[in-house]
Interface confidence: low
C-alpha cells in the first residue's frame, strides 16, 4: 500500500522534474534603456523562452528555489573610444532579493575592449561571457547590467543574451 | 497491477534518464577544412565523447528533442594581422533543420583580436567562448563556424572545442 | 516483491539524485599563492558552496563518477605590461588522477590582454572564461592554473571563480 501511495507521489515528482526550470532571453532593440537600469530582454520571439521561470522588467524571476547555472553574453563594439567613455566596461549578473534593499553582485567581468583600437576611427568588436552556479530562492530575481551600455551592440538576439537553468 | 506495469516503464525511463544526452568534441588537425564549411571535430579520442547525441560532418546531431545547453570555445592567435584578414572574427553556433533550407544563427560572437598587436610582428592570442540554452528537435544539427578560420589555433583538443548537454 | 524491493532502491537513488553534485568556489585574497601551484578558493563564505563534491588545496574533488560541466573565470588586469611578463597568459582547468603522475590539461585558453595597453601607464582589464563537459572518476581532482598569476585581479569573489555540476 505504501509503495502504491509513494508511487503516485514519485510519478508526480518525475513529471514536475520533466520541466527543469530553464530560460534563454535574447537582446532586442528595447534592451538598452539608457535609464541606468538593467538590460531588458525578449522572452518569447525567436530563440527566447521561459520554462519554469518568469520575467519582469529585465529580471529572471525564480519560482522554484535551487541551484541555477546562470549565464549572459554581451556583444560589445564601437569606433575608437567615444568621448567620456570609461576605458573599463563592466558586465555583471546581479541578484535582487526581497530580504535586502540592494542588488548583490553574483558574477562580474571587467574589460577594456576599446583599448584595442589604435586609432580613433578604428572599428572594434569584443564579447563578454559570464556563467556560474548560484543558489536562488523563490521570488529572487537576477538581472544583467552593463556599464557603459552605449557599447552593447544588438542585432538579432544571437549576440547578446541571458539565461539560466536549474542544476 | 497498474503500478507494477508503470513500474517497469519508470525504471526504463529512469535508466534512459541516466544517459542524459551530452557530448564534448575537441579540435584536431583535421578541424580546419578551408572549404568554407563548418569546423570538424574529434569525437572519440582523448577528452572527446558522445552520449545520447550523434555526429556527422562537423555537426552534433540531436536524437532526443529538448532544451540543450550548447557551447563552443575557439582559440585564436596570430602574428600581427595577416594581409587581407578582416579585422572582425565571427565565431558562431548554427542550427540546421530539415524544415528550413538555411542554417539558423543560435549564438554568435564578433571579436577584433589582432587589433591588440601594435606591430606587424607581434604575436597575439585570444579566445572566444559561447554558451546558451536552445531548443532542438530530433534530427536537428548544430555546427560551429569561424570566419576567418585561418586564425583558429589547434593543438591538443583543449583550446578549441564544442559540446552540449540536455538541461 | 521485486518491484517493492526495487522501489526502495529507486527512492534511494531519487533522493541521492536530488543532490546532483555541484559547486561554485570564489576567489579570495589567499587564492594567489605565488608558489607555482594552482589557485586556491573560498568554499563556504558568500556565494561559495560545495554540494556532493569536496575540496582540497585548490582542487575540486569528485566523490561520484560521471560527466561534469566544469567552468572557471579569471579577472585579469594590470597597468601596461610588467617587466619580464610574458605577453601570453594561460588559464586552464587541469585534472589530477591517482592513475597518472602528471596533471592532464582539460580546457585551456591563451590570451594576450596587456597588448591592449598602448602605453606603459595604461590600465587594462580582461576576462577569461572556460567551460566544458568532462568525465571524472571518484577521487579525481580538478584545479585551475593561471600563468602568469600576477595578473589575476581578485576582489570579492564575483570576478574570479571555479565551479562544476554533474550533467
Amino acid at each position: 500500500d505504501g509503495p502504491a501511495g509513494s508511487w503516485e507521489q514519485l510519478i508526480q515528482e518525475r513529471r514536475s522534474h520533466e520541466v527543469n526550470p530553464a530560460a534563454h532571453l535574447t537582446g532586442a532593440n528595447s534592451s538598452l534603456t539608457g535609464s541606468g537600469g538593467p538590460l531588458l530582454w525578449e522572452t518569447q520571439l525567436g530563440l527566447a523562452f521561459l520554462r519554469g521561470l518568469s520575467y519582469h522588467d529585465g529580471a529572471l524571476v525564480v519560482t522554484k528555489a535551487g541551484y541555477y547555472y546562470i549565464y549572459s553574453k554581451v556583444q560589445l563594439g564601437g569606433v575608437g573610444c567615444p568621448l567620456g567613455l570609461a576605458s573599463t566596461i563592466t558586465h555583471g549578473l546581479y541578484k535582487r532579493t526581497p530580504r535586502y534593499p540592494e542588488e548583490l553582485e553574483l558574477l562580474v567581468s571587467q574589460q577594456s575592449p576599446c583599448g584595442r583600437a589604435t586609432s580613433s576611427s578604428r572599428v572594434w568588436w569584443d564579447s563578454s561571457f559570464l556563467g556560474g552556479v548560484v543558489h536562488l530562492e523563490a521570488g529572487e530575481e537576477v538581472v544583467v547590467r552593463v556599464l557603459d551600455e552605449r557599447l552593447v551592440r544588438l542585432r538579432d538576439g544571437t549576440r547578446s543574451y541571458f539565461g539560466a537553468f536549474m542544476v | 497491477d497498474g503500478p507494477a506495469g508503470s513500474w517497469e516503464q519508470l525504471i526504463q525511463e529512469r535508466r534512459s534518464h541516466e544517459v542524459n544526452p551530452a557530448a564534448h568534441l575537441t579540435g584536431a588537425n583535421s578541424s580546419l577544412t578551408g572549404s568554407g564549411g563548418p569546423l570538424l571535430w574529434e569525437t572519440q579520442l582523448g577528452l572527446a565523447f558522445l552520449r545520447g547525441l550523434s555526429y556527422h560532418d562537423g555537426a552534433l546531431v540531436v536524437t532526443k528533442a529538448g532544451y540543450y545547453y550548447i557551447y563552443s570555445k575557439v582559440q585564436l592567435g596570430g602574428v600581427g594581422c595577416p594581409l587581407g584578414l578582416a579585422s572582425t572574427i565571427t565565431h558562431g553556433l548554427y542550427k540546421r533543420t530539415p524544415r528550413y533550407p538555411e542554417e539558423l544563427e543560435l549564438l554568435v560572437s564578433q571579436q577584433s583580436p589582432c587589433g591588440r598587436a601594435t606591430s606587424s610582428s607581434r604575436v597575439w592570442w585570444d579566445s572566444s567562448f559561447l554558451g546558451g540554452v536552445v531548443h532542438l528537435e530530433a534530427g536537428e544539427e548544430v555546427v560551429v563556424r569561424v570566419l576567418d578560420e585561418r586564425l583558429v589555433r589547434l593543438r591538443d583538443g583543449t583550446r578549441s572545442y564544442f559540446g552540449a548537454f540536455m538541461v | 516483491d521485486g518491484p517493492a524491493g526495487s522501489w526502495e532502491q529507486l527512492i534511494q537513488e531519487r533522493r541521492s539524485h536530488e543532490v546532483n553534485p555541484a559547486a561554485h568556489l570564489t576567489g579570495a585574497n589567499s587564492s594567489l599563492t605565488g608558489s607555482g601551484g594552482p589557485l586556491l578558493w573560498e568554499t563556504q563564505l558568500g556565494l561559495a558552496f560545495l554540494r556532493g563534491l569536496s575540496y582540497h588545496d585548490g582542487a575540486l574533488v569528485v566523490t561520484k563518477a560521471g560527466y561534469y560541466y566544469i567552468y572557471s573565470k579569471v579577472q585579469l588586469g594590470g597597468v601596461g605590461c610588467p617587466l619580464g611578463l610574458a605577453s601570453t597568459i594561460t588559464h586552464g582547468l587541469y585534472k589530477r588522477t591517482p592513475r597518472y603522475p602528471e596533471e592532464l590539461e582539460l580546457l585551456v585558453s591563451q590570451q594576450s590582454p596587456c597588448g591592449r595597453a598602448t602605453s606603459s601607464s595604461r590600465v587594462w582589464w580582461d576576462s577569461s572564461f572556460l567551460g566544458g563537459v568532462v568525465h571524472l572518476e571518484a577521487g579525481e581532482e580538478v584545479v585551475v592554473r593561471v600563468l602568469d598569476e600576477r595578473l589575476v585581479r581578485l576582489r570579492d569573489g564575483t570576478r574570479s571563480y571555479f565551479g562544476a555540476f554533474m550533467v
Epitope: 528595447s30 534603456t33 539608457g34 535609464s35 541606468g36 537600469g37 531588458l40 519582469h56 522588467d57 563592466t90 535582487r96 534593499p101 540592494e102 542588488e103 547590467r145 556599464l147 | - | -
Partner: antibody
Framework: QVQLQQSGPELVKPGASVKISCKAS????????MNWVKQSHGKSLEWIGR????????FYNQKFNNKATLTVDKSSSTAHLELLSLTSEDSAVYYC?????????????????WGQGTSVTVSS | DVVMTQTPLSLPVSLGDQASISCRSS???????????LHWYLQKPGQSPKLLIY???NRFSGVPDRFSGSGSGTDFTLKISRVEAEDLGIYFC?????????FGGGTKLEIK
C-alpha cells in the same frame, strides 16, 4: 524620514568649476538613483542626469555631457554635482532628487524626494 | 527629446473652484514594460518641487484626494476639485519614460 540636504549657495567666476553636494538620510542611499535638475531663474526644470550609487552607473542628458559630472561618496551617503567651465548661462538653482532604482510596477518611476536646492551664481 | 507642453501658462482661480491643467507630450509615454511614466509636481514660491501624482493617476503619499490625474498616450490632465490657498504655486508635468527626462514649462495657479 527621507531627507536630502544640499550644500550652500555658490558665487563663482566665469571659467571656473564648482562642486555641490547632496547628503542623503532616512533611506538606503545606494538603493536609489540620485537625479540632478537645473532651474534657471523664472524658468522650467531641466534634467541633468542621474547616478546609481550602488554601481556608479551614470546617465547624462546629452546637453550636459561636457558640463556636468556626477559622483557619489557611498561612505557618507553623499552625491556630488560638479559643473565645469562655468558661464552666466549656468547661473541657476540646482536640485538633487531621489528616484527608485528598479522602475518596478510598485515604484513611482518619478523623482519622489527633492533637496532644497543650491543656488549657483556665475559672475565676474 | 520629448517635449512636454502645458496649458494654460497661468490659471487664475477662486478658492473652492475646480482647476484643470493640461499636459501634452510630443510622443507616446507608454514604456515597454506597460507603465506610463507621466508625473505632476507642485513648486511653491521659494521651495523645491514636490511630487503630487505619479504614473498618470497615482497620488503620492500625503497628497490630498482633491488632486487627481488622468489621461493616456500623449494627453494628460491634472484636476484639483476644490482649490485651497496652500495649492497655489507652479505645477509641472514631467515624463520619465524616455531619457532624458523632461518637464513641462509650468502652469502658475494664482488667486483671481
Amino acid at each position: 524620514q527621507v531627507q536630502l540636504q544640499q550644500s550652500g549657495p555658490e558665487l563663482v567666476k566665469p571659467g571656473a568649476s564648482v562642486k555641490i553636494s547632496c547628503k542623503a538620510s532616512g533611506y538606503s542611499f545606494t538603493g536609489y538613483f540620485m537625479n540632478w535638475v537645473k532651474q534657471s531663474h523664472g524658468k522650467s526644470l531641466e534634467w541633468i542626469g542621474r547616478i546609481y550609487p550602488y554601481s556608479g552607473d551614470t546617465f547624462y542628458n546629452q546637453k550636459f555631457n561636457n558640463k556636468a559630472t556626477l559622483t557619489v561618496d557611498k561612505s557618507s551617503s553623499t552625491a556630488h554635482l560638479e559643473l565645469l567651465s562655468l558661464t552666466s548661462e549656468d547661473s541657476a538653482v540646482y536640485y538633487c532628487g531621489r528616484s527608485e532604482h528598479f522602475g518596478r510596477n510598485y515604484g513611482t518611476g518619478a523623482v519622489d524626494y527633492w533637496g532644497q536646492g543650491t543656488s549657483v551664481t556665475v559672475s565676474s | 527629446d520629448v517635449v512636454m507642453t502645458q496649458t494654460p501658462l497661468s490659471l487664475p482661480v477662486s478658492l473652492g473652484d475646480q482647476a484643470s491643467i493640461s499636459c501634452r507630450s510630443s510622443q507616446g509615454l507608454v514604456h515597454s514594460n506597460g507603465n506610463t511614466y507621466l508625473h505632476w509636481y507642485l513648486q511653491k514660491p521659494g521651495q523645491s518641487p514636490k511630487l503630487l501624482i505619479y504614473k498618470v493617476s497615482n497620488r503620492f503619499s500625503g497628497v490630498p484626494d482633491r488632486f487627481s490625474g488622468s489621461g493616456s498616450g500623449t494627453d494628460f490632465t491634472l484636476k484639483i476639485s476644490r482649490v485651497e490657498a496652500e495649492d497655489l504655486g507652479i505645477y509641472f508635468c514631467s515624463q520619465s519614460t524616455h531619457v532624458p527626462y523632461t518637464f513641462g514649462g509650468g502652469t502658475k495657479l494664482e488667486i483671481k
